[in-house]
Interface confidence: low
């Protein structure tokens, strides 16, 4: 297991498809590893775009060949399959497919696989074992849907060979390969502001930490060893270089901010919490 | 341990044909793309071959149409049938397992192909 | 195909020298360089993938640099088993292509 990854760990690729009329189309897909996004697609030159520097994995070079092949080919097939029967299927311009497809690990063993097919954000179809089956509340439109899909039984086969051989294959691969940049440990910025007043005689406390990962963090107001069940977490955002952000507020009545701290508890940290003083803060800001 | 051995050299005339093979053991034969490399006396490293863990099967462009590589996963194999060899031909070849991208991790020991009249 | 150009072609030094081998692509092959050992009578040996990764089982002395065209191999501190002959190997573009090599002899 990779430290800086939640188990279950998946690898999973994303195909949004953008249907905005009988001719005009876009896609966008991309592959993640667990939350962090490790691989996009280029669709002017049809080739998969490596973020990560390990992104590769241990395929080597022919069998990502082999890959784009297939997604560029799956890519064209999927676009006319769904013109061609969008009307029988009563999909309505504009309208959006998004299709997820990967595998999870769990305690280092391949767990299993999914592939899933939705419908305007709706859950419409789902690949099981070596075919497509409709998700029962979406209808007869997906199970004529699952029955044009499987028709090919074929192309059901490679889909099945991917989920179940080739994926696995590569998450395990991907994680010894990023071993060192997933295991890393960057320690947490911290500072305080003030956040916009909540009302008359009352204060926002932000407490901003930023720089960290891996991305699990625990972030509290205290006053002394009393954790402040008011603390707001906002979510935990992404930065550009690979580290996480996140900001926790607290409203306070503008005389009761004086014995509040912001803890900050991460493994980077070893037991050395980050500890700031909003007294410090205001006698400085 | 990864152990890759090499057989099938030997000493041809010009236009003659050889067939190789590497058995490979201590891994997962089948996870692995498959490579040919070879060494001419006294001379460089020069990419032969490869075979994909799918079966896609990539030459260099000086044996082309001449050399077919594949692999039988069930005997953890790799082959390469030479077909019209030439002089130049003449080299060590070493088969290697692909890892990192198209890095090399494991090669066998090699076996000699010698073409001449 | 991506040429592969190493300098010097050979190189004498001393035990306990520091080495330097530079490799040279004829475009940008970004990370994509992986270095090797060979001795005498011996298969290739992997020593630095991904320009400067390196492999599990060799000594820390050994380290890789560069990206894009220009990258280096070097050995921190020449040890007598260091003598042989080093290559470097693109990985970005199929046909894989390998550098002429550097025999490092002693001097």
């Known amino acids: 297991n990779a430290d800086g990854l939640k188990e279950p760990l998946s690898f999973h690729v994303t195909w949004i498809a953008s249907f905005y009329n009988h001719s005009w189309k876009q896609n966008l897909v991309s592959g993640w590893l667990s939350d962090l996004q490790t691989h996009t697609w280029d669709s002017n030159s049809s080739t998969i775009v490596f973020l990560c520097p390990w992104s590769r994995g241990n395929f080597s070079n022919e069998e990502w060949k082999e890959l784009e092949t297939l997604f560029r080919i799956r890519t064209i097939r999927s676009f006319e399959g769904i013109r061609r029967y969008a009307h029988e299927l009563q999909f309505e311009y504009p309208f959006e497919i998004q299709v997820t497809g990967g595998c999870e690990l769990h305690s280092g063993k391949v767990s299993g696989s999914f592939l899933q097919l939705a419908y305007q954000g709706s859950d419409f179809v789902s690949f099981q074992n070596n075919s497509w089956l409709p998700y029962p509340v979406a209808g007869n439109m997906a199970k004529h849907f699952c029955k044009v899909l499987n028709q090919n039984q074929h192309e059901n086969d490679i889909t099945h060979n991917l989920l179940s051989d080739t994926c696995p294959r590569f998450i395990l691969g991907l994680l010894d390969a990023g071993k060192a940049h997933l295991q890393r440990q960057v320690k947490p910025e911290a500072w305080l502001s003030h956040g916009p007043s909540p009302g008359p005689g009352h204060l926002q406390l932000v407490c901003h930490v930023s720089g960290f990962y891996p991305k699990p963090v625990w972030v509290m107001w205290m006053r002394g060893e009393q954790e402040q069940q008011g603390t707001q977490r906002g979510d935990i955002l992404p930065s550009a270089d690979g580290t996480w952000y996140l900001r926790a507020t607290l409203e306070v009545a503008a005389g009761e901010a004086a014995d509040l701290s912001c803890r900050v508890k991460h493994s980077s940290l070893e037991g050395q919490d980050i500890v700031l003083y909003w007294e410090h803060h205001s006698s400085v800001g | 341990e990864v152990q890759l051995v090499e057989s099938g050299g030997g000493l041809v005339h010009p236009g003659g044909s050889l067939r190789l093979s590497c058995a490979g053991s201590g891994f997962t034969f089948s996870s692995y793309a498959m490579h040919w490399v070879r060494q001419a006396p006294g001379k460089g490293l020069e990419w032969v071959s490869a075979i994909s863990t799918g079966g896609g099967t990539y030459y260099a462009d000086s044996v082309k149409g001449r050399f077919t590589i594949s692999r039988d996963n069930a005997k953890n194999s790799l082959y390469l049938q030479m077909n019209s060899l030439r002089a130049e031909d003449t080299a060590v070849y070493y088969c290697?397992?692909?890892?990192?991208?198209?890095?090399?991790?494991?090669w066998g020991q090699g076996t000699l192909v010698t073409v001449s009249s | 195909d991506i040429q592969m150009t190493q300098s010097p072609s050979s190189l004498s030094a001393s035990v306990g020298d520091r080495v330097t081998i530079t490799c040279r692509a004829s475009q940008s092959i970004s990370s994509y360089l992986n270095w090797y050992q060979q001795k005498p009578g011996k298969a290739p040996k992997l020593l630095i993938y991904?320009?400067?990764s390196l492999q599990s089982g060799v000594p820390s002395r050994f380290s890789g640099s560069g990206s894009g065209t220009d990258f280096t191999l070097t050995i921190s501190s020449l040890q007598p088993e260091d003598f042989a002959t080093y290559y470097c190997?693109?990985?970005?573009?199929?046909?894989?292509?390998f550098g002429q090599g550097t025999k490092v002899e002693i001097k």
């Open positions: 190997q693109q990985s970005y573009s199929t046909p894989p292509t």
């Open positions: 290697a397992r692909s890892a990192w991208w198209l890095s090399f991790d494991s």
């Open positions: 991904a320009a400067s």
